[in-house]
Interface confidence: low
């Protein structure tokens, strides 16, 4: 018996060939001997089967002795043995229809799990193998699960269902909803304007939801909500904003926040959360602000940084075009009785300057 695999929702064509290359009488029946379709001369006739409105044939092929059965919009329950009766002989074809669907939605938040469920006809024992866009293979039976989806899992998943040495392939487009970066750090001199950007790693036609930026200043004992906003069809509208600092927010995507000036009391880390409509859970992006200040008080030249700096960062004070006078893995360095000239305060990581502030020391007469 010939086995044909079909995909739910697709169209399948079951072939039936007579030895005579001409139009002769034929019938297609199901395993209950209920007539699906046949012919009377050059006319197509249909029987009382459940397939009635979804079954068809190709009259143009009858003259060549080919009498296909076409079933449109396949359903799992169409899985059956179909019998073609032609020239006093019977050809049997077993049709097995499979469906593969993603749990609830194909737009999933980063960190959520994807479950692919295989619908299969009773009595079948298929195996499934799926390949993710980043080349990861997963195997399973009726369900396949991938926990902790990552950004690289966005794209087309190709799944192969294997049954009776036959294969049928499904392609499922998965969109992982996430920010492009999990974390970012902004280095600013005191008084400079600060720009925070939160680009999304996906595009959808309609994007609606709401979000909030919580901020934990290094100097504060608890975190504080700096701004809450709504997102409607990619348009941003601010709901609430603190008076200090008074953030400004761009009206269009990508989400963009402006802090009028970097001050030591604002240095710290924030967590921007975005809850998308009809999605359980939220998108997160961490943002960090490091603020530098260089000051001269009487005979003391001081350079300080506030905010989340890594312990390997180096803070240095140097006179322009000279070797560093002081260089420490600390958050504050100073020089007593500095020489006159342009001093540079540098925050660097393995020799790469992240932040620089210049201060002019005048000669003392």
């Amino acid at each position: 018996k010939k086995v044909v695999l079909g995909k739910k929702g697709d169209t399948v064509e079951l072939t039936c060939t007579a030895s005579q290359k001409k139009s002769i009488q034929f019938h297609w029946k199901n395993s209950n001997q209920i007539k699906i379709l046949g012919n009377q001369g050059s006319f197509l006739t249909k029987g009382p089967s459940k397939l009635n409105d979804r079954a068809d044939s190709r009259r143009s092929l009858w003259d060549q002795g080919n009498f296909p059965l076409i079933i449109k919009n396949l359903k799992i329950e169409d899985s059956d043995t179909y019998i073609c009766e032609v020239e006093d002989q019977k050809e049997e074809v077993q049709l097995l229809v499979f469906g593969l669907t993603a749990n609830s939605d194909t737009h999933l938040l980063q960190g959520q799990s994807l479950t692919l469920t295989l619908e299969s006809p009773p009595g079948s024992s298929p195996s499934v193998q799926c390949r993710s866009p980043r080349g990861k293979n997963i195997q399973g039976g009726k369900t396949l699960s991938v926990s902790q989806l990552e950004l690289q899992d966005s794209g087309t998943w190709t799944c192969t269902v294997l049954q009776n040495q036959k294969k049928v392939e499904f392609k499922i487009d998965i969109v992982v909803l996430a920010f492009q970066k999990a974390s970012s750090i902004v280095y600013k001199k005191e008084g400079e304007q600060v720009e925070f950007s939160f680009p999304l790693a996906f595009t959808v036609e309609k994007l609606t939801g709401s979000g909030e930026l919580w901020w934990q200043a290094e100097r504060a004992s608890s975190s504080k909500s700096w701004i809450t906003f709504d997102l409607k069809n990619k348009e941003v509208s601010v709901k609430r904003v603190t008076q200090d600092p008074k953030l400004q927010m761009g009206k269009k995507l990508p989400l963009h926040l402006t802090l009028p000036q970097a001050l030591p009391q604002y240095a710290g880390s924030g967590n921007l959360t975005l809850a998308l409509e009809a999605k359980t859970g939220k998108l997160h992006q961490e943002v960090n602000l490091v603020v530098m200040r260089a000051t001269q008080l009487q005979k003391n030249l001081t350079c300080e940084v506030w905010g989340p700096t890594s312990p390997k960062l180096m803070l240095s004070l140097k006179l322009e075009n000279k070797e560093a006078k002081v260089s420490k893995r600390e958050k504050a360095v100073w020089v007593l009785n500095p020489e006159a000239g342009m001093w540079q305060c540098l925050l660097s990581d393995s020799g790469q300057v992240l932040l620089e502030s210049n201060i002019k020391v005048l000669p003392t007469w």
């Epitope: 609830s104 309609k206 909030e212 709901k239 809850a275 409509e277």
Partner: antibody, heavy 122, light 107 residues
Framework: QVQLVQSGAEVKKPGASVKVSCKVS????????MHWVRQAPGKGLEWMGY????????IYAQKFQGRVTMTEDTFTDTAYMELSSLRSEDTAIYYC???????????????WGKGTTVTVSS | ETTLTQSPAFMSATPGDKVNISCKAS??????MNWYQQKPGEAAIFIIQ???TLVPGIPPRFSGSGYGTDFTLIINNIESEDAAYYFC?????????FGQGTKLEIK
């Protein structure tokens, strides 16, 4: 502080329609989602649907599809729920509940009205 | 449709007691469970959000636990003002569904 004030009790005949109102104070209705829930005598609470102003979407529970209409008058900050083709089993207390000023969860029902009793009897 | 089975339907407690009210979901709903308190003739009050988070302004003697299918509302050191009807709500999928409710009486 969001508050919801519902219209008074109604007595209706089978086959008629009823329109229950829910007036919002302390906040603008356009920023709130409005859910409608009912409780028949001796039965549990039943969610009927909600209006989500963020995209103008109304979702009705399948059981009430075709019989219920949820609307809003943003000028008066009043939400309405109309139920048609009333039958005796629609006798219940009808509640409006809002997502309040939740920053994210438009589906939260964090503020409730006191309910409107609707009696369907011939 | 997710069915919520709440138990007990009725319970009696003495001031100072600890009470547990259970709500079981017919399918996995993650932590998408809210709890409410309602007194006769009054509007329902939102007490627990996302299964375990106490709503601001609610006394800390109320707490919630659970994830997936089994959830519990816990009231420690019960007070006479806690006499009310308590119900759970799942907002994981449409239609949102409620538990049958628990009537708590204080002796």
């Amino acid at each position: 502080q969001v508050q919801l004030v519902q219209s008074g009790a109604e007595v209706k005949k089978p086959g008629a329609s009823v329109k229950v109102s829910c007036k919002v104070s302390g906040y603008t209705l356009t920023a709130l989602s409005m859910h409608w829930v009912r409780q028949a005598p001796g039965k549990g609470l039943e969610w009927m649907g909600y209006f989500n102003p963020r995209d103008g979407e109304t979702i009705y529970a399948q059981k009430f599809q075709g019989r219920v209409t949820m609307t809003e008058d943003t000028f008066t900050d009043t939400a309405y729920m109309e139920l048609s083709s009333l039958r005796s089993e629609d006798t219940a207390i009808y509640y409006c509940a809002t997502g309040g000023d939740s920053d994210y969860y438009y589906y939260y029902m964090d503020v409730w009205g006191k309910g409107t009793t609707v009696t369907v009897s011939s | 449709e997710t069915t919520l089975t709440q138990s007990p339907a009725f319970m009696s407690a003495t001031p100072g007691d600890k009470v547990n009210i259970s709500c079981k979901a017919s399918q996995d709903i993650d932590d998408d469970m809210n709890w409410y308190q309602q007194k006769p003739g009054e509007a329902a009050i939102f007490i627990i959000q996302e299964a375990t988070t106490l709503v601001p302004g609610i006394p800390p003697r109320f707490s919630g636990s659970g994830y997936g299918t089994d959830f519990t509302l816990i009231i420690n050191n019960i007070e006479s003002e806690d006499a009310a009807y308590y119900f759970c709500l799942q907002h994981d999928n449409f239609p949102y569904t409620f538990g049958q409710g628990t009537k708590l009486e204080i002796k």
